[in-house]
């Protein structure tokens, strides 16, 4: 139903959705400071701008009683919930900040008529994706479909001379809700990666996954995977690896490679990292300090996403424009804004583009390196070490398929 | 419009050292692999060397890995190589050029001409 | 390494003509990359990925090849084409150039 939104006469309102369920276990008193940090920045931002405004944020919590697994799966309805308590309350902002889960944002943006905006620190999944009024400032699935398919024809670079048309895909039910979507998007018959890729295998039990390690009729010798190194050498452990072998390990929303005394342990020599370039300023700012590497992103996309709201209302309002307007609602796309820690690109549909980083373990120095970086906005790949020292035979990543010979050009689709 | 500009001729007697200079401008400086190339008179181009300027990373051609020294000053946009010990065959224009991958070398700086003589 | 081995090293050419000039890698490659260079001049990048033309390039130019022999051609020769022509690889570490094809008006 049509809910009057408290956004006009010089005071402008965030409703800020706290739910039980989240896309990471982040205490909500930690969204609340981030938020809250935001708040201070736009005031400052609008005040600069000779706009003499209110802005302020409500946090909407849901019913602990009903909603209290923390776990994403089980989310569907407690977003149409607090719309439901918003609605009898009468009491909606301008702007919808939360929910995370991809479950939750997808029911809600089903089940409301959604003139206003959306943003979300999450919805990962591509069923979220192409939608008209929601924003996204975590990386979706597809930004990271993209970046491997990409990667995956390749072969004009001195370290990798194939294209690959094949992957494993291991997927075991118990990953975190980010890695959940992003393996559920590979694992989609009718995704952009399955369509490009000739053989994709999923594979769901450990022992599938450790068997395949020295597997002499193995059908792909690269594996895609999500999680930090920890996860991987749970799976792995130190069992002997085939010397052909590539493991991608999706670990996006981790800091932790950057850091100055991290040693890559020997368990990472045969894996390529795909992570996100690290923000500079975030390890000192206050809503962060309390924060692990993994958790910065997070409570940053709620920060960022009070900041998109003042830099639109800042436009809309120098424009003499109306902000409870459909126009309103379908603006917070193809745009930069200043962010926390920098500018943050938006794609044609909302989402956050960023640059990707793909690392190796130098055999030399037992470092993480960068290998190459990945503009999603522009779907461009960056080289960076041109000569690095792999595990892998001749500094070159092997082919995907073992003994196809010196056939360079291969094309599967 | 990119451009590359390089620092003036030198000339150097035997075992001295030159440094190199090869400012950039019309892109971002920290977007683009630069890489260092040496023609010699009469002799083919020959690859030197390549730095990333933002994560600062630096491969070298095996055979001028203890001729050259590569480095940069990203807040000047501006890279750099040092050629130590120098001898008669290390007289030749030398290049920078930008990677635009998958254009690698697509532009290059005018050259800088290093004499070395007694 | 891979040596590239460009020929002929000399190409004297009437306007109007094609132009043809071959490279011949040490072992395979997937592409090659070609460069122009003129008296005085630094080069520029004229090909790239063995087929695509760099920005500005005109259309008379062309390139092909695949494995370890790669050509470029010039269907009709035009004065301003008079210069010497490398081809490169960066298949390999590290990338090597060809000793050059010099193309002059007859």
């Known amino acids: 139903s049509q809910v009057s939104q408290n956004c006009h006469n010089g005071s402008y309102e965030i409703s800020v959705l706290m739910m039980g369920n989240s896309a990471f276990a982040e205490p909500l008193k930690n969204l609340e400071d981030a938020v809250n940090e935001g708040l201070e920045i736009v005031r400052g931002r609008l005040q600069n701008a000779g706009l003499n405004v209110t802005v302020n944020a409500t946090f909407m919590y849901s019913d602990g009683l009903i909603h209290n697994s923390g776990d994403c799966r089980s989310s569907t309805c407690e977003g149409l919930d607090l719309l439901r308590k918003i609605s009898n309350a009468q009491r909606m902002g301008c702007v919808l900040i939360g929910p995370s889960c991809t479950y939750s944002t997808f029911q809600m943006y089903l089940d409301t008529e959604l003139s206003y905006p959306m943003i979300s620190a999450g919805s990962f999944g591509l069923s979220c994706d192409y939608k008209e009024t929601l924003t996204r400032l975590m990386s979706p699935a597809r930004k990271l479909m993209y970046f491997l398919v990409n990667f995956w024809k390749t072969n004009d670079l001195p370290f990798k001379t194939y294209s690959w048309s094949t992957s494993y895909v291991y997927k075991n039910g118990t990953e975190t809700e980010d890695c959940f979507w992003y393996l559920n998007a590979l694992e989609a018959s009718v995704s952009y990666f399955s369509h490009e890729l000739g053989f994709k295998v999923v594979l769901r039990q450990d022992k599938e996954f450790q068997d395949i390690l020295m597997d002499h009729n193995r059908k792909s010798n690269v594996i895609i995977m999500c999680g930090g190194p920890e996860f991987l050498y749970k799976l792995k452990g130190d069992r002997a690896v085939a010397e052909d072998i590539v493991i991608i390990l999706v670990d996006l929303f981790n800091d932790q490679y950057f850091e100055d005394n991290v040693t890559a342990p020997d368990y990472m020599k045969n894996v390529l990292v795909l992570t996100l370039s690290p923000g500079n300023s975030l390890l000192n700012s206050s809503f962060s300090r309390n924060l692990s590497p993994t958790k910065r992103d997070f409570a940053l996309a709620y920060l960022n996403g009070i900041l998109l709201f003042g830099h639109m209302l800042k436009i809309f309002l120098e424009n003499g424009e109306n902000i409870t307007t459909p126009k309103f609602a379908h603006a917070f796309r193809n745009l930069t804004f200043e962010g926390y820690d920098g500018p943050v690109t938006l794609d044609d549909w909302g989402d956050v583009d960023s640059t990707m980083v793909l690392l190796y373990t130098s055999v030399d120095t037992k470092k993480y390196k960068v290998l190459l970086t990945y503009d999603t906005h522009v779907n461009k790949t960056y080289p960076v070490d041109m000569s690095p020292t792999f595990t892998w035979k001749n500094s070159k990543l092997p082919n995907d398929i073992t003994g196809r010979g010196p056939q360079h050009h291969h094309h599967h689709h | 419009e990119v451009q590359l500009v390089q620092s003036g001729a030198e000339v150097k007697k035997p075992g001295a050292s030159v440094k190199v200079s090869c400012k950039a401008s019309g892109y971002t400086f920290t977007d683009h692999n630069m890489n260092w190339v040496k023609q010699a008179p009469g002799q083919r181009l020959e690859w030197m060397g390549v730095?990333?300027?933002?994560?600062?990373?630096?491969n070298y051609n095996q055979k001028f890995k203890d001729k050259a020294t590569i480095t940069r000053d990203t807040s000047a946009s501006t890279a750099y190589m040092e050629l130590s010990s120098l001898r008669s065959e290390d007289t030749a224009v030398y290049y920078c050029?930008?990677?635009?991958?998958?254009?690698?070398?697509?532009?290059w700086g005018q050259g800088t001409t290093v004499t070395v003589s007694s | 390494e891979i040596v590239l081995t460009q020929s002929p090293d000399f190409q004297s050419v009437t306007p109007g003509e094609k132009v043809t000039i071959t490279c011949s890698a040490s072992s395979s490659v997937n592409y090659m990359y070609w460069y122009q260079q003129k008296p005085d001049q630094s080069p520029k990048s004229w090909i790239y990925?063995?087929?695509n033309l760099a920005s500005g390039v005109p259309s008379r130019f062309s390139g092909s090849g695949s494995g370890t022999d790669f050509t470029l051609t010039i269907s009709s020769l035009e004065a301003e084409d008079a210069a010497t022509y490398y081809c490169?690889?960066?298949?390999?570490?590290?990338?090597?150039f060809g000793g050059g094809t010099k193309v002059e008006i007859k």
């Open positions: 990925r063995t087929s």
């Open positions: 730095m990333n300027p933002k994560f600062g990373t630096i």
């Open positions: 050029a930008r990677d635009d991958y998958p254009n690698y070398f697509d532009y």
């Open positions: 490169q690889q960066y298949h390999d570490y590290p990338p090597t």
